[in-house]
């Protein structure tokens, strides 16, 4: 029986800038229960905070809620594992809201076959920004990418569409049914996870660009 | 609606020992940092302890360190001051407060008033 | 510990008219800084935290500013229940400390 091992904090993330949720791994138990807590105090201040909610994140997380996240301030947290032989901390983690967002998928992605009479056929789409992101603030610049494959191919086909929520795509492969996905990020921050696949019958006549 | 209710107030002679209580109901009690802040005429407003969620920070006023001792019972929504060894000067009216933003109390008790006085 | 000091302790000032409360504290708290009402027989309410944050509820014209050291409550047009005590706090350090109070009386 031993004090347990070092606990490590691996990952924080943010959907929104407005609330935040950070996650640990445990060390080794010591053959023993073993306790955990997440402790921080924000940069400038030497109060300690203990973290205010260990279930909404799930097994061995803390979630901060929108009267304890601050865009504008580092935190620096720890975790301290307890069990009847002893103590161990992780290490130190800095924390920046700003840097640690990761939105929700965009939605309502929608995926049309246009063919203009005086122009060659294109794939048409479009989306809409993630619910909890308000764009309005301007604390926020979302950019967008989106992939495309057929539907049995292996490799997908991945286009940059900066900050707009509309896009085309000239070249495909008439006759096939192709899935298409967006994901987007913000500025200082992590891709989203992708959205849902939409699919799309491309028709047979479809011209393909030069 | 949020509602902290204290209790075990009274009057007692120098030496003696008082136990408070708060009541919280109307928010999640186990979620958050509560504290203890006493008012008197002659010194105003005294923070004298702080008790984290699951009571792994706690904090005491020098004047109050060795003869008080803040805890919490999640399970029952209360808060608890046992003060021991009292002296005349921690006469004041004792609030509970909490609901915090970051350490600050948005909700406060109206308070009990402590006597000490032989 | 942190001394904080509230300039004046009291201001006489008449319904819709500015006020303006200062406290100075004895070393940096940096933004970790708050603003307390309190009226006779209640406890104190929170104003403002984080040196500029307005509270759940509380009106518009009450606003804060400052960092450091220097701290500034204004309330842009007194009602009649504005007339109170108010209170500065910090709470950057421990033990946290508040000012001995401004009393807003009317004139």
């Known amino acids: 029986q031993l004090p347990p091992g070092k606990p490590e904090i691996f990952k924080c993330r943010s959907p929104n800038k407005e609330t935040f949720t950070c996650w640990w791994r445990p060390g080794t138990d010591g053959g023993l229960p073993t306790n955990y807590s997440l402790t921080y105090h924000r940069e400038g201040e030497t109060l300690m905070h203990e973290c205010p909610d260990y279930i909404t994140g799930g097994p061995n997380s803390c979630h901060f809620g929108k009267q304890y996240t601050s865009m504008w301030r580092t935190y620096v947290m720890m975790v301290n594992a307890t069990n009847q032989m002893g103590s161990s901390f992780s290490d130190e983690l800095y924390v920046d809201v700003t840097y640690i967002v990761q939105p929700d998928p965009p939605l309502e992605l929608t995926v049309e076959v246009k063919q203009p009479e005086d122009r060659k056929p294109y794939l048409w789409m479009k989306w809409s920004p993630p619910t909890l992101i308000d764009l309005k603030t301007g604390w926020f610049t979302l950019l967008y990418e989106i992939r495309l494959k057929p539907e049995k191919a292996a490799e997908w086909e991945t286009h940059f569409a900066g900050q707009q929520t509309e896009f085309k795509i000239l070249s495909l492969h008439p006759g096939q049914k192709y899935l298409v996905q967006v994901r987007c990020k913000p500025d200082h921050g992590y891709w989203s996870a992708w959205s849902p696949a939409t699919f799309i019958q491309i028709p047979s006549d479809f011209i393909m660009n030069d | 609606e949020v509602h902290l209710v204290e209790s075990g107030g009274g009057l007692v002679q120098p030496g003696g020992s008082l136990r408070l209580s708060c009541a919280a109901s109307?928010?999640?009690?186990?979620?958050?940092?509560m504290n203890w802040v006493r008012q008197t005429p002659g010194k105003g407003l005294e923070w004298i302890s702080h008790i984290s969620s699951r009571s792994v920070i706690i904090y005491y006023a020098d004047s109050v360190k060795g003869r008080f001792t803040i805890s919490r019972d999640n399970a029952k929504n209360s808060l608890f001051l046992q003060m021991n060894s009292l002296r005349a000067e921690d006469t004041a009216v004792y609030f509970c407060?909490?609901?915090?933003?970051?350490?600050?109390?948005?909700?406060w008790g109206q308070g009990t008033l402590v006597t000490v006085s032989s | 510990e942190i001394v904080l000091t509230q300039s004046p302790a009291t201001l006489s000032l008449s319904p819709g008219e500015r006020a303006t409360l200062s406290c100075r504290a004895s070393q940096s708290v940096s933004s970790y800084f708050a603003w307390y009402q309190q009226k006779p027989g209640q406890a104190p309410r929170l104003l403002i935290y984080d040196a500029s944050s307005r509270a759940t509820g509380i009106p518009t014209r009450f606003s804060g500013s400052g960092s450091g050291t220097d701290f500034t409550l204004t309330i842009s047009s007194l009602e009649p229940e504005d007339f109170a005590v108010y209170y500065c706090q910090q709470r950057s350090s421990w033990p946290i400390t508040f000012g001995q109070g401004t009393r807003l009386e009317i004139k």
């Open positions: 109307g928010f999640t009690f186990s979620s958050y940092e």
């Open positions: 407060a909490g609901i915090t933003i970051f350490g600050i109390p948005e909700y």
